[in-house]
């Protein structure tokens, strides 16, 4: 039975040209983590295996950074990167599970003026 | 227990246009997530993808079929379609619906309608 | 496209016996590769996901290994009801696409 849950940052913005950290974490299991898959909608950004180690999809090696951990680091965002991530999580004996983060790129001035006033 | 469930006319002449529908059952085409995609398998068995919905509505299709082929669904009845037109007899083929993953393979296929392009 | 061969289009065995086929990737996919069982006049179905991963109810006697751009399937152990075409898929990038099949035949 599957009983892990994957906590995520959830929807997050960040400035245009800037970088963003995308972090999943698995807790609430005792599976063992064997392979995390990070994904877009239609394509793969990058594979962390406890094997192999990190690939990073071709299109994505001149801004894509892996880590911390087994998360994900985007960077020289662009609007196109606008959003749904995904992390895998493959496990053993549990299976996969799966988690969501929205990223919205916004531009300079946007995410400036949103910062200012972020309701507490 | 999530079931696809292909229909189609069967046989049509070339140069017309076909229109499939797919029937979803025990799952929301709208659960997050999930693509409902079209895939079809000629006879000598070789699968090629034509193109998905995802649950969000947006649309992506095969490159190689993009010219021909339209995607579009019906929500409230759980259903989405295929439209392909300027068929010719190379588009003879068992068309499948399925339902595809995060991780793009598809896990729940529906049985397959058998479509013919003959005059 | 990413071209997925499937060098053996038949191949012959016996119950019990271990049988492996083989799939090659025209590009690194790293691990995203996924099998699927078609048996005489049903659709395909799933057994192996990310190159190695069973999928829910798979029997045990099906594995997958491989990385980058050669990858295997193995039936440790045929049984009869095995009788089926089994593809490779790369779930790396789109457009997915698919081996030709390979069809494992019961002597």
């Known amino acids: 039975m599957m009983t892990g849950t994957i906590e995520t940052t959830g929807n997050i913005s960040a400035e245009k040209g800037g970088s963003i950290i995308l972090q999943c974490h698995l807790s609430s299991t005792t599976a063992q983590v064997t392979q995390v898959n990070w994904e877009q909608q239609d394509q793969l950004l990058a594979i962390c295996n406890a094997d192999l180690g990190w690939h990073i999809s071709p299109s994505f090696k001149d801004r894509v950074a892996p880590g911390p951990g087994l998360g994900l680091t985007l960077q020289s965002l662009t609007v196109n990167d606008t959003g749904e991530y995904f992390c895998i999580y493959h496990t053993y004996p549990d299976g996969t599970y799966t988690g969501r983060i929205f990223l919205e790129v916004l531009e300079s001035s946007v995410a400036e003026h949103g910062a200012r006033f972020q309701i507490p | 227990d999530v079931q696809l469930q292909e229909s189609g006319p069967g046989l049509v002449k070339p140069s017309q246009t076909v229109f499939l529908t797919c029937t979803v059952t025990?799952?929301?085409?709208?659960?997050?997530?999930?693509?409902w995609s079209w895939i079809r398998q000629f006879p000598g068995n070789k699968l090629e993808w034509i193109g998905y919905i995802y649950y969000s509505g947006t649309i992506t299709y095969n490159p190689s079929l993009t010219s021909r082929t339209t995607i579009t669904r019906d929500t409230p009845k759980n259903q989405f379609f295929l439209e392909m037109n300027s068929l010719t007899a190379e588009d003879t083929a068992t068309y499948y619906c399925?339902?595809?993953?995060?991780?793009?393979?598809?896990?729940?296929w529906g049985q397959g309608t058998t479509l013919t392009v003959s005059s | 496209d990413i071209v997925m061969t499937q060098s053996h289009k038949f191949m012959s065995t016996s119950v019990g016996d271990r049988v492996s086929i083989t799939c090659k990737a025209s590009?690194?996919?790293?691990?995203?590769v996924a099998w699927y069982q078609q048996k005489p006049g049903q659709s395909p179905k799933l057994l192996i996901y990310s190159a190695s991963y069973r999928y829910t109810g798979v029997p045990d006697r099906f594995t997958g290994s491989g990385s980058g751009t050669d990858f295997t399937f193995t039936i440790s152990s045929v049984q009869a009801e095995d009788l089926a075409v089994y593809y490779c898929?790369?779930?790396?990038?789109?457009?997915?696409?698919f081996g030709g099949g390979t069809k494992v035949e019961i002597k």
């Open positions: 590009q690194d996919v790293s691990t995203a």
């Open positions: 898929q790369q779930h790396y990038s789109s457009p997915r696409t």
């Open positions: 399925a339902r595809e993953t995060v991780l793009r393979v598809f896990d729940y």
């Open positions: 025990g799952i929301s085409i709208t659960t997050g997530n999930y693509k």
